[in-house]
Amino acid sequence: DSSKWVFEHPETLYAWEGACVWIPCTYRALDGDLESFILFHNPEYNKNTSKFDGTRLYESTKDGKVPSEQKRVQFLGDKNKNCTLSIHPVHLNDSGQLGLRMESKTEKWMERIHLNVSERPFPPHIQLPPEIQESQEVTLTCLLNFSCYGYPIQLQWLLEGVPMRQAAVTSTSLTIKSVFTRSELKFSPQWSHHGKIVTCQLQDADGKFLSNDTVQLNVKHTPKLEIKVTPSDAIVREGDSVTMTCEVSSSNPEYTTVSWLKDGTSLKKQNTFTLNLREVTKDQSGKYCCQVSNDVGPGRSEEVFLQVQYAPEPSTVQILHSPAVEGSQVEFLCMSLANPLPTNYTWYHNGKEMQGRTEEKVHIPKILPWHAGTYSCVAENILGTGQRGPGAELDVQYPPKKVTTVIQNPMPIREGDTVTLSCNYNSSNPSVTRYEWKPHGAWEEPSLGVLKIQNVGWDNTTIACAACNSWCSWASPVALNVQYAPRDVRVRKIKPLSEIHSGNSVSLQCDFSSSHPKEVQFFWEKNGRLLGKESQLNFDSISPEDAGSYSCWVNNSIGQTASKAWTLEVLYAPRRLRVSMSPGDQVMEGKSATLTCESDANPPVSHYTWFDWNNQSLPYHSQKLRLEPVKVQHSGAYWCQGTNSVGKGRSPLSTLTVYYSPETIGRR
């Protein structure tokens, strides 16, 4: 009610002889500040004196002085809120009731606190979760209802008497609600922790043992099993007997069911701790284990690999890889179920034993066509020899072999003929599916492997064919040796190197680019007249009369070929000059007279000079000299000179006679 002082503190505090006690305490006085405080041990109220009797452990005076014998007990509070106390050291006879007598100006109060001091350090208390399961993290708690600032302690966890390695978290509480020291240890128990002793040990600051609490771990776990087999190596022969025993090394709680598994599958009607296998067959080879269940779940033993030994079964051959390419490597593997594994093998190729081949694998580093065929093997172990299986077929693939190009025509082949060629080969695997020809042309292939060349050209020198399956094999080129008339016949001047001047020595060559056959004859012709039968036509001293159109012919057994006409040009100085007169060499004065300088020259005359009877050159340089009107004085002998790049020529004198006209005669 409102007439009470309000106090907060732990109801009971625990300690032991020689330790200390720290009493956290708060209060609220009814009025004003605290004026007097007395700490009683086991106070008793005396009705006669209306005061409390008992041992006074602490007494505060108005002046705040404390007698020296009270140093063991300390009031750590104040005048209005804090009433914390410390007793250090605490003794066994301090057990009982502590009475806090508080007085203010007008009010008084007695607050009682229980103190429990034991002769020896009391043990902490281990708290476990209600259930511990293997591999599930748990927290172990060690609680001690003691904490005091003046007396440091530690809690240590032990497993089977030795310190636990896991990290523990220690906490202390010194509050008005509770006083304790607590250590919490988190760990993940395994089934093997079951039944083990865990200790929480209370130690002083120096690690000296004070007290402890122990618990036995009850770790729930699936059954832990051991499997034993007779014979111990679990290797038997067909017809033998085998016994397997399942032993439970640990189960918590107790196991409920037992079963056996082979290769992970449950064996029916096998629900005892012993598995008896009588007259075993090879099919009973495999991995066996026992499974025992409890409320936590099933536990399995390690697997026992039972090997039932038997002679090799009929073998099969595996080829890596078929079809094989010639030149590649191939591996043959002899596969035969046997226990123990075969130790020896016999290999057969097309039914014939392969000498020196006794391994499970046969390796051929470089396959050849003759390696093709059927491969079989026989496996052998300590129990016997197996049967030869059906074998496997090795297909060796290779490009077409010995490819040749064959000319079907009668020889020789002439230009323009139709030529037929065939592509032949010796063997091929896989079969030839196509052919290729070189060089490529617009030729027809009337059937597979046959080439027809219509109107064969003179220059179709060689042809090669390829027969192709997955690969192409080329034949050596075959020469068609096409025969043809001489080609590209032409006339070539050998000398002189420059233009031909009259009197030069001249040689003409009849050239051709090719001829097959090579043996040829030559013919030279000018204006349809045969000049010679040599490859060269020679002129010791050429004359203008030799100029003209020349042709040469070259012929062989196939035919003859003519060159284009070649013009022979001879350069010479003007010659055969003469002066012609028009209308004649006798002209009447007053008329017109034309003198023409005629010549034969190559190149033509480029420059003319006229002379009179006095050899005086006249101021005229054209081919014609026109006199108009002509005078009697013009009468006389005239000559002309012609010039070209080669030289000069002069004409003989030609006389012009100018006679008087009738008029002139009439005047005279």
């Epitope: 390695r165 993940s188 395994q190 083990k196």
Partner: antibody, heavy 118, light 108 residues
Framework: QVQLVQSGAEVKKPGESLKISCKGS????????ISWVRQAPGQCLEWMGW????????IYAQKLQGRVTMTTDTSTSTAYMELRRLRSDDTAVYYC???????????WGQGTLVTVSS | EIVLTQSPATLSVSPGERATLSCRAS??????LAWYQQKPGQAPRLLIY???TRATGIPARFSGSGSGTEFTLTISSLQSEDFAVYFC??????????FGCGTKVEIK
């Protein structure tokens, strides 16, 4: 200083038994546990089991249960590990290691090479 | 049992560089994880325990971090003597221990 000294290398045949010793010195032998760990060539470390030198109680790895026995002789501060029915896959280096306790530091033996071969 | 997975299997680092090694637990192991160094022909040597506390005599360049299921060992500046195999070990189920298969730290 703390030291763990193991017995020397062994060569065994399949089916035989093996017993390795581990002598502790430089500390209070009974205040700690001893773990046994093995390492097969090129493999991970594998914990085999533990014994409390305080009272001789043991915890074994399940896969070795029934084949392994760990003991101590407190008078000579020596721990022993016996492995029976040896197999070729028991070839390994076997180590003993002292528990770290509250200090955090652990100590290992130098290792014993065991070869199991027929 | 608690399975520890270490990554990477091999770590190629140049001397002076930083190396970060990872260890993952299949179940929480709180901070009950240790790191070991092993050199050829030698026993493992404790580096870190309690996930982050350096063992006696271990240089400050080695540091550990993490809790629960994810843990990291960091070597801040690799020295020539640090090239070795590093294992993590959980002791949450002590005395039953499990180890990671290791990370090999090799010279780049």
């Amino acid at each position: 200083q703390v030291q763990l000294v193991q017995s020397g290398a062994e060569v065994k045949k399949p089916g035989e038994s093996l017993k390795i010793s581990c002598k502790g010195s430089g500390y209070s032998f009974t205040s700690y546990g001893i773990s046994w760990v093995r390492q097969a060539p090129g493999q991970c470390l594998e914990w085999m089991g533990w014994i409390s030198a305080y009272n001789g109680n043991t915890i074994y790895a399940q896969k070795l249960q029934g084949r392994v026995t760990m003991t101590t002789d407190t008078s000579t501060s020596t721990a022993y590990m016996e492995l029976r029915r040896l197999r070729s896959d028991d070839t390994a280096v076997y180590y003993c290691a002292r528990d770290p306790g509250v200090t955090g530091d652990d100590y290992w033996g130098q290792g014993t090479l065991v070869t199991v071969s027929s | 049992e608690i399975v520890l997975t270490q990554s990477p299997a091999t770590l190629s680092v140049s001397p002076g560089e930083r190396a970060t090694l990872s260890c993952r637990a299949s179940l929480s192991v709180s901070s009950n994880l240790a790191w070991y160094q092993q050199k050829p022909g030698q026993a493992p040597r404790l580096l870190i325990y309690g996930a982050s506390t350096r063992a006696t005599g271990i240089p400050a360049r080695f540091s550990g971090s993490g809790s629960g299921t994810e843990f990291t060992l960091t070597i801040s500046s690799l020295q020539s003597e640090d090239f070795a195999v590093y294992f993590c070990q959980q002791y949450h189920s002590w005395p039953a221990l499990t180890f990671g298969c290791g990370t090999k730290v090799e010279i780049k």
